[in-house]
């Protein structure tokens, strides 16, 4: 089973200039080799994937993952019960909803079972790692001759999410975007009846219930208005 490791928004791609430079190379042993970083995301508070780059290991190694919650009733060390694999090597762990406690400090420990001293422990705030599902059921209604209202649904507690609406006409080269708070509706006050509009929305777990940086996927687009005779190649490229 091959897993896809999520790196949303393309802003997490720094290479780690790790610290073999700070130690004499002749003194390196297996236990001093750094372990890969663990990155966790909580998907719609339904499950959580904690993944690592298994290919960074000098030789294929089935690293093991343990976790617990600091200062809580759930502070007993737990073994990963559902590993994710990449080319038959462990590359992640999936935790189910009942194992996710958003507002307690999550502690995750990666270990090399062949070299138990080779371990790394990280602490995470899960409320900052929630990625909601994309908004669904986009609907448009006309409020007046020139005003449109866009509505949508989220499969989550609505007050926890903020939203970003993008829209464009088939004459536009770029999207216009507008931030929307937890109310999940957006009004466009002046619509040109001669143009075809495309709308899409994404959501983020911020700022009331967490401080997540990552947005959901974009919703399926929804269209309004007549097809224009001017075909814009940008529109088709962005919808692909």
């Amino acid at each position: 089973l091959n897993t896809t490791i999520l790196t949303p928004n393309g802003n997490e791609d720094a290479t780690t200039d790790f610290f073999l430079t700070s130690m004499p190379t002749d003194s390196l042993s297996v236990s001093t080799l750094p372990l890969p970083e663990v990155q966790c995301f909580v998907f719609n508070v339904e499950y959580m994937n904690c993944t690592w780059n298994s290919s960074s290991e000098p030789q294929p190694t089935n690293l093991t993952l343990h976790y617990w919650y600091k200062n809580s009733d759930n502070d007993k060390v737990q073994k990963c019960s559902h590993y994710l694999f990449s080319e038959e090597i462990t590359s992640g762990c999936q935790l189910q909803k009942k194992e996710i406690h958003l507002y307690q400090t999550f502690v995750v420990q990666l270990q090399d079972p062949r070299e138990p001293r080779r371990q790394a422990t990280q602490m995470l705030k899960l409320q900052n790692l929630v990625i909601p599902w994309a908004p669904e059921n986009l609907t448009l209604r006309k409020l007046s001759e020139s005003q449109l209202e866009l509505n949508w649904n989220n499969r989550f507690l609505n007050h926890c999410l903020e939203h970003l609406v993008q829209y464009r006409t088939d004459w536009d080269h770029s999207w216009t975007e507008q931030s929307v708070d937890y109310r999940h509706k957006f009004s466009l006050p002046s619509v040109d009846g001669q143009k075809r509009y495309t709308f899409r929305v994404r959501s983020r777990f911020n700022p009331l219930c967490g401080s997540a940086q990552h947005w959901s996927e974009w919703s399926h687009p929804i269209h309004w208005g007549s097809n224009s005779s001017k075909e814009n190649p940008f529109l088709f490229a962005l919808e692909a």
Epitope: F19, P34, L124, N128
Partner: nanobody, 126 residues
């Protein structure tokens, strides 16, 4: 390569405050997870406070509510404000840094840190 230099240690009475500073040179603090650790005589080195470059900070149970970590990227420095010091806080305090790829990575394991300062002695008398 990162060089770390701690300052601000000393001998104080129980209940007093101290502020430790850690100045980094050799590179900026961006994309560095930072940590404060301490080692008392005859004991293992233990984490005190750790911070990811995304801004999440975590404290050891024993110092939560008394110690405060802060970071000044412009000055390439991190600080540990220690209030209500107790004799059991007596230790050598070390600043540590680890280059990380992810904004959320905050290591509480000392062996995950690449770079270390020389340490600052903090002694709390009763």
């Amino acid at each position: 390569q990162v060089q770390l230099v701690e300052s601000g240690g000393g001998l104080v009475q129980a209940g007093s405050s101290l502020r430790l500073s850690c100045a980094a040179s050799g590179r900026t603090l961006s994309r560095l997870a930072m940590g404060w650790f301490r080692q008392a005589p005859g004991k293992e080195r233990e984490f005190v406070a750790v911070n990811s470059w995304g801004g999440d900070t975590f404290y050891a149970d024993s110092v939560e509510g008394r110690f405060t970590y802060s970071r000044d990227n412009a000055k390439s420095a991190v600080y540990l404000q220690m209030n209500s010091l107790q004799p059991e806080d007596t230790a050598v305090y070390y600043c540590a840094a680890a280059p990380t790829s992810f904004a959320t990575t905050a290591y509480s394991s000392s062996n995950s840190y690449a770079y270390w300062g020389q340490g600052a002695q903090v002694t709390v008398s009763s």
